[in-house]
């Protein structure tokens, strides 16, 4: 993520493109365009003769990380000779307008290349003034004014979760370690068939719905956030979140688990079949044989109505079941229905039968070339 240890931090922002700084008082935007409502402006001390003191100082770039700390860095290698430049700062037209010295310098090859300010020293909505100075040439100094609310970079979104809203709709949720209403988000998603990400802007609500999901494809989602537009107008996005994956072949992800699953299913199936067979044979032994209607008449005739003789019921039990009254014998026969077997004839295809279950839709996969 974005929160590195200090030595790394000191190098991280030296890599950002640095602007050349002129001798005249200028107002610059971060991309170098002149603008009277800039996030910062820079002044240098003009002199008549060209000497060391007229060399422009490198531009200072400040970024506020999740409003936890701020790094202000400069390109120390732009100096003609290694120089430990010093940094002072204050807040314009505020209670914090006392000039402060940097108390925590960042170094690159043992030369000062930045300053880190802690949370208590950051006031987002006051104009931050930063001054870089060459201690050997006190006249050689540069001052910049910054709107810190436009320089916030949040941490990457965390805890991405996916859940199905319906058979074909997915919802992505995430968290930010910051006041959520201050951030906007960019969601990117793709399948393994896509050669490019599809992206969607999301407001402060930190949730995203994908209305149409192909069940046969695998999806990847990632999110990044920006401090914009409600609390500031930052241009820089956070790092991307860790991606989250959803889709077809998740069961094949771990070959060991896949094999284990196959074994468990096989053993379970065999166990179930054996159990059913055992139950069947046990029932065969313990339950009386129940005749089918087809041969009931023959049995009654053959055994002269003696139920216990052919059923396997003990003589004692049979006697206890004997009624103390006589009944007429009533023969029952089944008349087969007209019209043949169930499901034959028109209108009987599986597609036309009403069922409480829906068959999944068919997908035709086409390469996106």
């Amino acid at each position: 993520m974005l929160k590195p240890s200090l030595p790394f931090t000191s190098l991280l922002f030296l890599q950002l493109p640095l602007l050349g700084v002129g001798l005249n008082t200028t107002i610059l935007t971060p991309n170098g365009n002149e603008d009277t409502t800039a996030d910062f402006f820079l002044t240098t001390m003009p002199t008549d003769s060209l000497s060391v003191s007229t060399l422009p100082l490198p531009e200072v770039q400040c970024f506020v990380f999740n409003v936890e700390y701020m790094n202000c860095t400069w390109n120390s290698s732009s100096e003609p000779q290694p120089t430990n430049l010093t940094l002072h700062y204050w807040y314009k037209n505020s209670d914090n307008d006392k000039v402060q010295k940097c108390s925590h310098y960042l170094f690159s090859e043992e030369i000062t290349s930045g300053c880190q300010l802690q949370k208590k020293e950051i006031h987002l909505y006051q104009t931050f003034v930063v001054q870089l100075q060459d201690p050997r040439e006190p006249r050689r100094q540069a001052t910049q004014m910054l709107k810190l609310q436009n320089l916030v970079i949040p941490w990457a979104p965390e805890n991405l979760t996916l859940h199905k809203l319906s058979e074909s709709q997915l919802e992505l949720n995430w968290n930010n370690r910051f006041l959520n209403h201050c951030l906007e988000h960019l969601v990117q998603y793709r399948t393994d068939w896509d050669h490019s990400w599809t992206e969607q802007s999301v407001d402060y609500r930190h949730k995203f719905s994908l209305p149409s999901v192909d069940g046969q494809k695998r999806y990847t989602f990632r999110v990044r956030s920006r401090f914009n537009p409600l609390c500031g107008s930052a241009q820089h996005w956070s790092e991307w979140s860790h991606p989250i994956h959803w889709g077809s072949n998740t069961s094949k992800e771990n070959p060991f688990l896949f094999a284990l699953e196959a074994v468990v299913i096989s053993v379970g199936s065999m166990g179930l079949i054996i159990s059913l067979l055992c139950v069947y044979f046990w029932l065969e032994r313990t339950m009386p044989r129940i005749p089918t209607l087809k041969n009931l008449e023959d049995l009654v005739t053959e055994y002269h109505g003696n139920f216990s003789a052919w059923s396997g019921v003990s003589k004692g039990l049979a006697e206890s079941l004997q009624p103390d009254y006589s009944e007429r014998l009533c023969l029952v026969s089944e008349i087969p229905p007209k019209g043949g077997a169930l499901g034959e004839g028109p209108g009987a295809s599986p597609c036309n039968q009403h069922s409480p279950y829906w068959a999944p839709p068919c997908y035709t996969l086409k390469p996106e070339t």
Partner: antibody
């Protein structure tokens, strides 16, 4: 027919800069993310950078982060790679390719040589 | 970063042979695996994407399979024009996109 033609390569000293261009035709440029992939002659392929369809999202290999900038001009159907603070290890044939994640079509490449 | 390892680094085969090249990822990449062919002095050409989907215009003798960490590219009956270097590439965890070191297929 899809065509990608790179230009802008050449010999440059360490610390110098170059801007590579890739002119495209034969496909809907706006529909594709685009990438740069480099190859040291006789060696394997190394992904350098990608940009999404509208230019709003860029990704870089760690080896070039902070030194190279990818951009695109959809109106001109062109892809660019601004290379600053060049090093000897940046010497390679630079291919532009369609796609951000895998690469459907490739240009023949432009050779960048960083040497003192 | 995910490392991609191809094997073998080079192999010799004859026209008509069935050839298999394998690619192993240092962690599971699901089916986010693509294969390219590169001939000397030419740009690489996409053969297979999403592990097993044949890019349009690529002969059906090329096929890809695998999921997770182990993948194969198979050429069912080698043709003279198939002698080239083949690369696998993962697009699961990006950035960075990473390639295998390549497999050089030579005529025996």
């Amino acid at each position: 027919e899809v065509q990608l033609v790179e230009s802008g390569g050449g010999v440059v000293r360490p610390g110098g800069s170059l801007r590579l261009s890739c002119a495209t035709s034969g496909f809907t440029f706006d529909d594709y993310g685009m990438s740069w992939v480099r190859q040291v002659p006789g060696k394997g392929l190394e992904w350098v950078s990608s940009v999404n369809r509208n230019g709003g999202t860029t990704d870089y290999a760690d080896s070039v982060k902070g030194r190279f900038t990818i951009s695109r001009d959809n109106a001109k159907r062109s892809l660019f790679l601004q290379m600053n603070s060049l090093r000897a290890e940046d010497t390679a044939l630079y291919h532009c390719a369609t796609g951000e994640l895998f690469f459907d079509y490739w240009g023949q490449g432009t050779l960048v040589t960083v040497s003192s | 970063d995910i490392q991609m390892t191809q094997s073998p680094s080079s192999l010799s085969a004859s026209v008509g042979d069935r050839v298999t090249i394998t690619c192993r990822a240092s962690q599971s990449i699901s089916s986010y695996l693509n294969w390219y062919q590169q001939k000397p002095g030419k740009a690489p050409k996409l053969l297979i994407y999403a592990a097993s989907s044949l890019q349009s215009g690529v002969p059906s003798r090329f096929s890809g399979s695998g999921s997770g960490t182990d993948f194969t590219l198979t050429i069912s009956s080698l043709q003279p024009e198939d002698f080239a270097t083949y690369y696998c590439q993962q697009s699961y965890s990006t950035p960075p996109i990473t390639f295998g070191q390549g497999t050089r297929l030579e005529i025996k």
